[in-house]
Amino acid sequence: FERTRSLQDPCSNCPAGTFCDNNRNQICSPCPPNSFSSAGGQRTCDICRQCKGVFRTRKECSSTSNAECDCTPGFHCLGAGCSMCEQDCKQGQELTKKGCKDCCFGTFNDQKRGICRPWTNCSLDGKSVLVNGTKERDVVCGPSPADLSPGASSVTPPAPAREPGHSPQ
């Protein structure tokens, strides 16, 4: 079948990094500068991605693979293949329409990206607040108030802080 296909379509013999040039009797021609073909049998080469402005080149384009970009310091990637660069904020802030803004009371962000999330409500788990939350840190929940009553034989060690889920990007 492969041999038949080759006889029918000479372009199938053109390897990655080349294209089947209709203008030259379907000869396999190398991809021109700043273009690539990642698979064989291509009739055109794709234009290489250019990393401009806040995007910087992580991997140069080659004749067989596209360039890859990431973001300059102070920005981070969003989207598949780093299709966007978003400005960092400080911990304890979130990026809004008006720029980096401090987290409202009762919320926190321990990263330079993402949104401010509510502090854990310790009472929902029947626990008490061991360490207060801040703009940068979630509260730490401790033993339940009953465990701390006088005469309790032992104090249970504080529960580890709940790992906050990452905010959707």
Epitope: R49, K52, G53, V54, F55, C69, F75, L78, C82, S83, M84, C85, E86, Q87, L95, T96, K97, K98, G99, C100
Partner: nanobody, 122 residues
Amino acid sequence: QVQLVESGGGLVQPGGSLRLSCAASGFTFSSSAMSWARQAPGKGFEWVSGIYSGGSTYYTESVKDRFTISRDNAKNSVYLQMNSLKPEDTAVYYCATWGTLRFGVWAEYDHWGQGTQVTVSS
């Protein structure tokens, strides 16, 4: 093809003013949001200001009340009027399309100019 050409940079004393211009071509300017970014010596990029096609404007906190972004769709140009300049405003200023319409966010399809140097020094 898309071209963005900045001009108007230069050396200015603290407290002085400059007006940057960005001449755009190769795309439908009137329906495109535009932005300004800057890169200070040895530092990363910073999102400075943006303007929607309808004229709504946005600024980073450090330039609010000092910088004004505007556009002239008839001239395919966007401007950045910079007043009360400070030494920390020293940077290369870039004009860029702003397809995401999100503060501090650019996409891979956005286009960038080559930049114009602004130096604030006595």
